[in-house]
């Protein structure tokens, strides 16, 4: 049940006065109190609770000779750099003997000039591409009112009429300047300036408009640039390996791309210098004054196949009576896709040219018509891929077969 | 003289809600937390939460954080405690007390017995 | 949170008899910076208000007669009452202080 008979008689002569000043500032709060006997530690409470790391200092005056003559206690707290952390209700504590005694209150408050929390940040936009930029100010003195500017143009009537924490910016065409200004009753606080810089959308519908062994033809339809004409587009191709990382969509490819720069407009390049029958992706990007846009996906393309570009090697023919034996080898240049087989052409001198498709072997025996008595008997070679063929071999004469 | 005076009883419909009172007197109200304690009957005692009047700072035990909440009115020196959803398991005896910082004095009201029961 | 143990639940004495209870906290209850254990003991009897007999784990009450006695320091703590009187039936809680307020679970004392 209460028990109000407690004595409760507080030893503070001293209370805490009030400190209200802007951020930054440095005050002290005072505590004395008169004690008979050994001085107690003096504590500090700010809403409460006991100060754990308080910058606090403590003298004592003894006010007679003796031990248990009276004694003054001062006890100041040093605020430094004045946050809104400190504020709040600050008392002093004392454990005299059983008893707690807790002194009058004092108050610390923040008052001056807003402070930024979140201030606009410098950043890259798409040109005619919405964004959106944020500030937040706060005092103590509350409200706080928002004006946003743009290349120093505030972008409403007054302060508070216009957007507060966010900005809506629909698009721009040019690179531009933003900054917010926080207004209280103390006055004006004024964030750093932003720069929005105007980069190219990212080019659309990059797209093959021919294709060779060792080229390909592509166009792009180019994004609006703003106020800044593109000066160049660059191109990337890189060779794909089924494993790799750009098909899952990641930014980067595996291996150095090969780079090719196109003066616009046109836009399109050619791309020469390619491997046949391979698979590639590319991608492009296109520059302003401000800077490049964002890279295309990945577009993934194939170069065709190609005639291989030499005829087959070592070439031998034999005849032997009515029959003739023909070996050669795969042709050593590059074979621009996929071997589907060889032609073989023999002729006489005054008989028609015979045209075989042999497949993919490497050999074949020739039934010669008659006796075999046709003079001056030559063969031909040739290797083909699904483009067609290569070219043909020089002709070879057939040689009488020795036993032996 | 200091006092911590709370009405009696209360009787509320289940379902409904309930504001508690706790006037202070004899001291400085706003220097001193106020703390309230559940008490269901033949049951021990539970800490509910606290509230500094000076700033209004609350602290609630997790247990009764969607049940409770604490308010102050420094120009009356009253502590009230408001009770939500109330059912037969919120019937109980609601103490508030002054901490004295772990210390002597400490003054507990006698606290009001609310029932809940349609 | 600070978890608070008491034992026993109850017990049963006769008038004139040394009783102890004890309290255990699941970490210390000692301020480093006051040099004080925030331990109390409170005393309730049916239909009444807690009433407070030991503060800082072993300072009493101004009031409360001598046969209590708090001590402990750190995480155990116990209470003794030196000769049970017919008054000192009752439930007797522990309380912590050191970080918000828990109760322990009490400690019923009957007089056979």
């Known amino acids: 049940a209460p028990r109000g008979t407690q004595a409760e008689e507080s030893p503070f002569v001293g209370n805490p006065g009030n400190i209200t000043g802007a951020r930054g500032l440095t005050g002290t709060l005072r505590c004395q109190l008169q004690v008979q006997g050994e001085p107690p530690e003096v504590h500090w409470l700010r809403d409460g609770q006991i100060l754990e790391l308080a910058d606090s200092t403590q003298t004592q005056v003894p006010l007679g000779e003796d031990e248990q003559d009276d004694w003054i206690v001062v006890s100041q707290l040093r605020i430094t750099s004045l946050q809104l952390s400190d504020t709040g209700q600050y008392q002093c504590l004392v454990f005299l003997g059983h008893q707690t005694f807790v002194s009058q209150p004092g108050y610390v408050g923040l008052e001056g000039l807003p402070y930024f929390l979140e201030e606009p940040e410098d950043r890259t936009v798409a040109a005619n591409t919405p964004f959106n930029l944020s500030c937040q100010a706060q005092g103590p003195p509350e409200p706080v009112d928002l004006l946003w500017l743009q290349d120093a143009v505030p972008l409403a009537t007054a302060p508070g009429h216009g957007p507060q924490r966010s900005l809506h910016v629909p698009g721009l065409n040019k690179t531009s300047s933003f900054s917010c200004e926080a207004h209280n009753a103390k006055g004006v606080t004024t964030s750093r300036t932003a720069t929005i810089t105007v980069l190219p959308q990212q080019p659309r519908n990059l797209h093959l408009v021919s294709r060779q062994p060792t080229e390909l033809e592509v166009a792009w339809t180019p994004g609006l640039s703003g106020i800044y004409p593109l000066t160049h587009c660059t191109l990337q191709a890189v060779l794909s390996d089924d494993g790799m990382g750009i098909q899952a969509g990641e930014p980067d490819p595996p291996e150095e791309p090969l780079t090719s720069q196109a003066s616009v407009p046109p836009h399109q390049l050619r791309l020469g210098s390619l491997h046949p029958h391979t698979p590639y992706h590319i991608r492009v990007a296109c520059t302003s004054s401000q800077g490049p846009s964002s890279w295309t996906h990945w577009l993934p393309v194939e170069t065709p196949e190609g005639v291989p570009l030499g005829p087959p090697e070592n070439i031998s023919a034999t005849r032997n009576g009515s029959q003739a034996f023909v070996h050669w080898q795969e042709p050593r240049a590059p074979l621009q896709g996929t071997l589907l087989g060889y032609r073989l052409a023999y002729q006489g001198q005054d008989t028609p040219e015979v045209l075989m498709d042999i497949g993919l072997r490497q050999e074949v025996t020739l039934e010669l018509q008659g006796d075999g008595s046709v003079s001056n008997l030559t063969v031909c070679v040739a290797a083909y891929t699904a483009a067609g063929d290569g070219p043909w071999s020089l002709p070879v004469p057939l040689e009488a077969w020795r036993p032996g | 003289q200091v006092q911590l005076q709370q009405p009696g009883a209360e009787l509320v419909k289940p379902g409904a809600s309930v504001q508690l009172s706790c006037k202070a007197s004899?001291?400085?109200?706003?220097?001193?937390?106020i703390n309230w304690v559940k008490q269901r009957p033949g049951q021990g005692l539970e800490w509910m939460g606290n509230i500094f009047p000076g700033s209004s700072s609350t602290n609630y035990n997790e247990k009764f954080k969607s049940k409770a909440t604490l308010t102050v009115d420094k120009s009356s020196s009253t502590a009230y405690m408001q009770l939500s959803s109330l059912t037969s398991e919120d019937s109980a005896v609601y103490f508030c007390?002054?901490?004295?910082?772990?210390?002597?004095?400490?003054?507990w009201g006698q606290g009001t017995t609310l029932t809940v029961s349609s | 949170d600070i978890v608070m143990s008491q034992s026993p639940s109850s017990l049963a004495v006769s008038a004139g008899e040394r009783v102890t209870m004890s309290c255990k906290s699941s970490?210390?209850?000692?301020?480093?910076?006051?040099?004080?254990?925030?331990l109390a003991w409170y005393q309730q009897k049916p239909g009444q208000s807690p009433k407070l007999l030991i503060y800082?784990?072993?300072t009493r009450e101004s009031g409360v007669p001598d046969r209590f006695t708090g001590s402990g320091s750190g995480t155990d703590f116990t209470l003794t009452i030196s000769s049970v009187q017919a008054e000192d039936l009752a439930v007797y809680y522990c309380?912590?202080?050191?970080?918000?307020?828990?109760f322990g679970g009490g400690t019923k004392l009957e007089i056979k």
């Open positions: 309380k912590q202080s050191y970080n918000l307020w828990t």
């Open positions: 007390a002054r901490d004295y910082y772990g210390g002597s004095p400490d003054y």
């Open positions: 004899g001291y400085t109200f706003i220097s001193f937390w």
């Open positions: 970490q210390s209850l000692l301020n480093t910076r006051t040099r004080k254990n925030y």
């Open positions: 800082w784990a072993s």
